[in-house]
Interface confidence: low
């Protein structure tokens, strides 16, 4: 068991690399990446290392959340001597080695990003040959995902007293603001929840009591786009319908 | 070689604030997060929170949030532990101790003994 | 939080033979990754503790072989295949697979 050092590198500015008369173990990753939701991302992670000439077995690996106990989204290896790191899992098949970590270089692709990806990630490297060592980024890389506003819920429900209630709710990075129009309202903001905690993409607002039939519409909006839906209340009709 | 050095007792009065210290050597202080441990006499231990001396970060256990305040010196090489509002119920030996490759405690302090009395 | 739970005594044992100290968590620490998060501790009589074995299975520098621990996600036994004079403590087990990370209430081992 090699007692190994752990990286508190923040970002590339402050990382402490001796090149003599021997590495250490470091990582430099920087502090954030940010892409927009159905696009691809590449998280940049290169290390140093104490064992000059290993060209064992190793492992590359990086996982979601938290250091060491987070889960894994991908992992390769490769056979001593190889310079291909045969993918041994792939996280929904999104996830593909970037660099060739013979030469240092952990950096992943995530393909296809949803606001879901929008979490911190730790690269790992294990050495397992004759010298048996590994390490991995501490502090990590926050993957940052933009997406334009997608409403993902708006209905009608029965309050008390004969009454109904509308609620709306978005997701979006930034959290979009939303608004409510419809009879009687003018543009009204109602009451916005935001964000729901669990939930940091989505915004829900609500609009109390709907004193007049007809058509409400919802729009969310933020730095990347505008996304509108509507709901259309017949009080009299003895029913509620969404439209969206 | 790796040493985490505290001082053996103090001895503080009921509703002072003590301040306890934790002196790190032989390693880089930066790249180790450092924990607080917590034993009553004669009682099992009670994780109390960690800092990470790099960027001064603190997580706390909720049952110590507004008791223990976790802090660093970087140039001395040091971690702190404030505590406040002293009751005899925080009469206890205090560890610090480093955080190790996985984040277990692989290095330990000798403790202190908080003593709090009139 | 995660419960750990021990028993606050071992049965005595003579030394040379063997001993066995169990643990018990109230969730799984086996992680999806692989790893369990489960520690052993020694705190030896007037001294801090110091760290005995690491993600369940792996032994801490410096410990002898004489240790050993295995386990499924919620139970977890330590394992002294000759114990020593020197053995003589308190066995705290330990998990770090959440925040706040937690201790068993230890478990002494008496001699006979």
């Known amino acids: 068991f090699v007692r190994t050092k752990i990286d508190t590198t923040e970002n590339l500015l402050n990382t402490e690399v001796h090149s003599s008369p021997a590495q250490r173990w470091s990582m430099q990753v920087p502090p954030e990446v940010s892409a927009e939701a159905g696009d691809a991302a590449v998280l940049p992670c290169t290390f140093t290392h104490p064992h000059r000439h290993y060209d064992g077995p190793l492992t590359a690996i990086w996982r979601a959340g938290e250091p060491y106990a987070g889960p894994q989204v991908f992992r390769c290896a490769a056979a001593r001597g190889s310079e291909l790191c045969q993918t041994a899992l792939s996280l929904h098949g999104r996830f593909r080695l970037l660099g060739n970590p013979r030469r240092n270089d952990l950096s992943l692709r995530v393909e296809r990003l949803a606001l879901a990806d929008d979490r911190r990630y730790f690269c790992r490297v294990e050495f397992a040959g004759d010298v048996h060592d590994r390490y991995e980024s501490r502090h990590g890389v926050r993957l940052h995902v933009t997406a334009a506003p997608r409403i993902v819920n708006i209905s009608v429900l029965p309050s008390p007293a004969h009454a109904f209630r509308a609620l709306c709710t978005a997701e979006g990075e930034p959290p979009p603001a939303l608004a409510w129009s419809g009879p009687a309202l003018g543009n009204s903001l109602a009451a916005v929840r935001s964000p729901r905690e669990g939930h940091g993409h989505l915004v829900t607002a609500e609009l109390p009591a709907l004193t007049h039939d007809g058509r409400y519409t919802c729009t969310a909006a933020n730095s990347l786009g505008r996304s509108e839906a509507s709901v259309y209340l017949f009080r009299f009709h003895g029913a509620s319908g969404a439209s969206t | 070689q790796v040493q985490v050095q505290q001082p053996g007792a103090e001895l503080v009065k009921p509703g002072a604030s003590v301040k306890l210290s934790c002196k790190a050597s032989?390693?880089?202080?930066?790249?180790?997060?450092m924990h607080w441990v917590k034993q009553r006499p004669g009682q099992g231990l009670e994780w109390i929170g960690l800092?990470?001396?790099?960027?001064?970060?603190?997580n706390y256990n909720e049952k110590f949030n507004t008791k223990a305040t976790l802090t660093v010196d970087k140039s001395s090489s040091t971690a702190y532990m404030q505590l406040s509002s002293l009751t005899s119920e925080d009469s206890a030996v205090y560890y610090c101790?480093?955080?190790?490759?996985?984040?277990?405690?692989?290095?330990w302090g000798q403790g202190t003994t908080l003593t709090v009395s009139s | 939080d995660i419960v750990m739970t021990q028993a606050a005594f071992s049965n005595p044992v003579t030394l040379g033979t063997s001993a066995s100290i169990s643990c018990r968590s109230s969730k799984s620490l086996l992680h999806s990754n692989g790893i369990t998060y489960l520690y052993w501790y020694l705190q030896k009589p007037g001294q801090s503790p110091q760290l005995l074995i690491y993600q369940m299975s792996n032994l801490a520098s410096g410990v002898p072989d004489r240790f050993s621990s295995s386990g499924s996600g919620t139970d977890f036994t330590l394992r002294i295949s000759r114990v020593e004079a020197e053995d003589v403590g308190v066995y705290y087990c330990?998990?770090?697979?959440?925040?706040?990370?937690?201790f068993g209430g230890g478990t002494k081992l008496e001699i006979k």
């Open positions: 330990a998990q770090n697979l959440e925040l706040p990370y937690t």
């Open positions: 101790a480093r955080g190790g490759d996985g984040d277990y405690f692989d290095y």
């Open positions: 800092i990470n001396p790099s960027n001064a970060r603190t």
């Open positions: 032989g390693y880089t202080f930066t790249s180790y997060w």
